[in-house]
């Protein structure tokens, strides 16, 4: 009963709730993660306990710095949600829970162009699709390097498309497109396309 | 289909020790909690130990020490070590499957060995 | 920890509305950690109920539970003949360690 008194007794500011997070709250699977469980108060011994659901996954004892749990998300149970406790003797508090969202990333985009050609002028448009990988995708479309689109949302596996028009150049050109959905620093391209100078006949995708 | 299927109970003398084993099938240990559970005759059912899907292991107070639980992922097999044993172990010993992420809602059972202890 | 469960034993008609109950001496992690299970004799227990209320699958509706923290209850709105079995309540703590518990178990008869 002492010790339950002495929980009683500590005032909320003095053991408040524990706080759980991470780096990384978009992730893939097979993706490492770690996670994070910290406490305001850096003069106690406390024991940090991770559960997700209601399965515990390991428990660490800290002073000042917060334990680190590090897990590997494989599964799509494996999303959370997660919450630690921070225990003293008999004290404890738990965190709010914390999930990720598991992404599929995205697949290569293929890049299709259709031109038609005027006298002075050619009118290209660029479609831009990635078949697999977490909706929304957004696209964004490039010529020789330089993004002359802003980024395109697909809340559904549509092409996007993006329009522009052209003087008849000298040189050729190359287009690409480039998805990406919400993981981090996860960008994919697609094959570049090349198209030719207008010298000749050769305008391999226009409409005749 | 999913199964347990528990052996390797039978008589053993006091102060001996017997190991069972908690064969799989159907699902990876990988991902489910097996739990085992044992009911003296006539008695209520007992709640031994835990092995969760990382490997981490629980064990009841009077089970510390004298009871082991491991596993073979290889194998898909749950092992409990008795050591020491005494005429009150005597029972019908159950491993169960928990859902996962929540290791005690045990939602597949094996069907039960029988472990005697006597002299 | 005690999982106390009362009464011990029940004696009933078929029909009739029946409830047991589950007393823990400390609350179940999350105050909802808490499986119902019936028991037949020679046969492996069956989940009834998980999270104190939900319904495990294939179970009929008859079956249902309540309670948080430390009380629970079991009912069973219109006990039909297949319904005579031992019944056990199991509660997930994490207070000192994580650990299970059982209920002492509630024999249902009939009358």
């Known amino acids: 009963r002492k010790a339950v008194l002495d929980c009683e007794a500590m005032k909320t500011n003095e053991f408040p709730s524990p706080c759980l997070d991470s780096k990384t709250k978009v992730v893939m699977k097979g993706q490492n993660v770690s996670m994070f469980c910290s406490h305001k108060n850096k003069s106690l011994q406390i024991t940090y306990s991770l559960f997700r659901r209601k399965t515990h996954l390991g428990t660490q004892d800290g002073k000042g710095e917060p334990a680190i749990f590090n897990l590997s998300i494989t599964e799509a149970h494996e999303s959370g949600p997660y919450k630690c406790k921070a225990q003293v003797t008999s004290c404890s508090k738990y965190s709010r829970d914390f999930s990720f969202t598991i992404v599929d990333p995205v697949t290569s985009p293929v890049l299709n162009i259709m031109v038609i050609q005027t006298e002075t002028d050619r009118h290209i448009t660029l479609h831009c699709l990635s078949v697999n990988g977490s909706l929304p995708i957004n696209y964004t479309f490039f010529e020789n390097h330089v993004a002359i689109s802003p980024a395109i949302s697909k809340y559904d596996r549509e092409p996007a498309e993006f329009n522009l028009t052209k003087k008849n150049p000298g040189e050729e050109e190359e287009y690409r497109c480039e998805a990406k959905n919400r993981l981090p620093n996860y960008a994919t391209y697609s094959h570049p396309v090349t198209m030719p100078s207008t010298g000749g006949d050769s305008c391999p995708f226009c409409l005749k | 289909e999913v199964q347990l299927v528990e052996s390797g109970g039978g008589l053993v003398q006091p102060g001996g020790s017997l190991r069972l084993s908690c064969a799989a099938s159907?699902?990876?240990?990988?991902?489910?909690?097996i739990t085992w559970v044992r009911q003296a005759p006539g008695k209520g059912l007992e709640w031994i130990g835990t092995?969760?899907?990382?490997?981490?292991?629980y064990y009841s107070t009077w089970a510390k020490g004298r009871f082991t639980i491991s596993r073979d992922n290889s194998k898909n097999t749950v092992y409990l070590q008795m050591n020491s044993l005494r005429a009150e172990d005597t029972a019908v010993y159950y491993c169960?499957?928990?859902?996962?992420?929540?290791?005690?809602?045990?939602?597949?059972w094996g069907q039960g060995t029988l472990v005697t202890v006597s002299s | 920890i005690q999982m106390t469960q009362s009464p011990s034993s029940l004696s009933a008609r078929v029909g009739d509305r029946v409830t047991i109950t589950c007393q823990s001496s400390?609350?179940?992690?999350?105050?909802?950690?808490l499986s119902w299970y019936q028991q037949k004799p020679g046969k492996a227990p069956k989940l009834l109920i998980y999270?104190?209320?939900r319904l495990a699958s294939g179970v009929p509706s008859r079956f249902s539970g309540s309670g948080s923290g430390t009380q629970f209850t079991l009912t069973i709105s219109s006990l039909q003949p297949e319904d005579f079995a031992t019944y056990y309540c199991?509660?997930?703590?994490?207070?000192?360690?994580?650990?299970?518990?059982f209920g002492t178990g509630t024999k249902v008869t009939v009358l």
């Open positions: 169960a499957r928990g859902y996962v992420d929540s290791d005690w809602y045990l939602n597949i």
């Open positions: 159907g699902f990876s240990l990988t991902i489910y909690t």
């Open positions: 092995i969760n899907s990382y490997g981490n292991t």
């Open positions: 400390e609350s179940v992690y999350d105050n909802n950690y």
């Open positions: 999270d104190a209320s």
């Open positions: 199991l509660g997930g703590y994490d207070s000192s360690g994580w650990y299970a518990a």
